[in-house]
């Protein structure tokens, strides 16, 4: 940038130094040099001399015209060719920027991670603006009508200490830059409904040496929330498809979940929880990899054909992952949900 250039004249931009990308732009240079009647006035963009679309308006002033200017940033300066001077003489310079007005922020979400002491709000900013864009988060109590505002760049963490006067709020985000302003839709927030339980962690897993080997996965959380609903997803490391089991959990003790898995296979497990009946999930836990032991009997055990866990797990679904190399980033793409029934000798192979 050239914020502190000493000008011997003036430079100005129409429609302005920050303008909408793709607009036609005129940049004017007016010299006020002592002891110089310039033969020529030259324009430079990012240090390179411009050759085209330059008009000499009068003895002191010239203009350069750009059709559909689409560079996000450029440094313009102009010089004079003074008789008797070997070098060109600097007249003035300007930083110019082009960009877009902001889109209305979308998908506004606010959550309180248990024990964090903050309400974290995130949103989609939309297409890139290429210019400095700020976001003003408005938090208005529905009980006291008081409004707080927070400046942010992409997300905001608001201390729950500053949300003491009320439980119900209206939250919205205002996107502001030099070219415009847009508001998100308003989000109704009840502080008791947006708590995400403290992180769930898979601590260990073991496979028993029984005739029908079973794998027990141990998992825990430091949450103080009594009613928690969890999902555990698992698959072999070579597979693209996740199986998902659901549990009602009580974290006053370590959870144990039993699985009947293929022998001699490497499995990856992940768990996530939410407060029962609420909509915000934890992120999936770090992948936990477990190798099942080699088969002792002759039966090739199908993972779907055996009794399910002792807990309230009822639903198993299959979910296809985007990439087997990044288990943490896998998304639910399609789910075929089916109920598990206790096995009673008549093994079902479910596809």
């Amino acid at each position: 940038g050239i914020t502190s250039i000493n000008c011997s004249g003036d430079m100005w931009v129409e429609p302005g130094e920050i303008f909408q990308m793709g607009m036609n732009v005129s940049i004017y240079c007016q010299e006020a040099l002592k002891h110089c009647r310039p033969r020529n006035l030259y324009f430079y963009k990012n240090g390179f001399k411009e050759e085209f679309d330059i008009t000499r308006i009068n003895r002191t002033t010239a203009r350069i015209w750009y059709k559909g200017f689409s560079e996000p940033h450029a440094y313009m300066h102009c010089t004079a060719e003074c008789p008797g001077h070997f070098q060109e003489t600097l007249i003035c310079g300007k930083d110019i920027s082009s960009g877009h007005p902001p889109d209305a922020p979308s998908n506004l979400t606010c959550v309180i991670y248990e024990y964090s002491g903050n309400m974290t709000c995130t949103w989609n900013t939309g297409k890139p603006t290429y210019i400095d864009t700020k976001y003003i988060v408005h938090v208005k109590s529905l009980e006291t009508e008081e409004e707080q505002q927070y400046l942010a760049s992409s997300y905001v963490k608001i201390s729950t200490d500053s949300l003491q006067g009320s439980r119900k709020y209206l939250v919205w985000v205002q996107a502001v830059n030099s070219l415009g302003m847009e508001n998100s839709q308003q989000l109704h927030v009840h502080l008791d409904d947006i708590v995400i339980p403290s992180a769930s962690i898979i601590s260990r897993a073991e496979t028993t040496n029984d005739t029908v080997p079973k794998t027990i996965v141990y998992w825990k959380s430091k949450t103080m929330i009594e009613k928690v609903f969890c999902e555990m997803r698992y698959k072999t490391t070579t597979n693209q498809t996740w199986s998902v089991k659901e549990f009602d959990a009580n974290f006053t003790y370590v959870q144990q979940s039993e699985f009947y898995l293929e022998p001699d296979s490497k499995y990856v497990f992940q768990v996530r929880c939410q407060e029962t009946g609420k909509r915000n999930w934890q992120p999936w836990s770090s992948p936990f990899v477990h190798q099942t032991s080699q088969e002792t009997g002759k039966r090739n055990w199908q993972p779907w054909s055996s009794p399910f866990v002792h807990q309230t797990s009822q639903t198993v679904s299959q979910v296809t992952a985007k990439s087997s190399h990044e288990p943490q980033k896998m998304e639910m793409l399609s789910a075929t949900i089916f109920r598990g029934h206790p096995a009673s000798g008549n093994h079902q192979d479910i596809g």
Epitope: I136, E147, Q148, Q149, Y150, L151, A152, S162, Q174, V176
Partner: nanobody, 116 residues
Framework: QVQLQESGGGLVQPGGSLRLSCAAS????????MRWVRQAPGKGLEWVSG???????IYADSVKGRFTISKDNAKNTLYLQLNSLKSEDTAMYYC??????????GSQGTQVTVSS
């Protein structure tokens, strides 16, 4: 009730500096975002700068790099430091609640005149 009292304006030469103050009462200042707006002679209100309760700031392009907004929660006072003043900064300056917007709530304002 909410009260805001601006001060610190005056006559200054181009390139000079001033510090404006806004004394606030009648609300929880430390939790409140604030802004400065101005009105040049014969023109409409123009938003200048804003600050939230945590000290994050935002500026109009016309003053970026020259003006600095700040707040002192212990003194319930909002400030605007004006440097490298230009003739086009001549205006009545007002403070208001909220980080952004070209309105104010009827405080008296303080006059800044930049002239040689």
């Amino acid at each position: 009730q909410v009260q805001l009292q601006e001060s610190g304006g005056g006559l200054v030469q181009p390139g000079g500096s001033l510090r404006l103050s806004c004394a606030a009462s009648g609300f929880t200042f430390r939790l409140t975002a604030m802004r400065w707006v101005r009105q040049a002679p014969g023109k409409g209100l123009e938003w200048v700068s804003g600050i939230d309760s945590r000290g994050s700031t935002i500026y109009a392009d016309s003053v970026k790099g020259r003006f600095t907004i700040s707040k002192d929660n212990a003194k319930n006072t909002l400030y605007l430091q004006l440097n490298s003043l230009k003739s086009e900064d001549t205006a009545m300056y007002y403070c208001a609640q909220g980080v952004y917007g070209d309105t104010y709530s009827g405080s008296q304002g303080t006059q800044v005149t930049v002239s040689s």
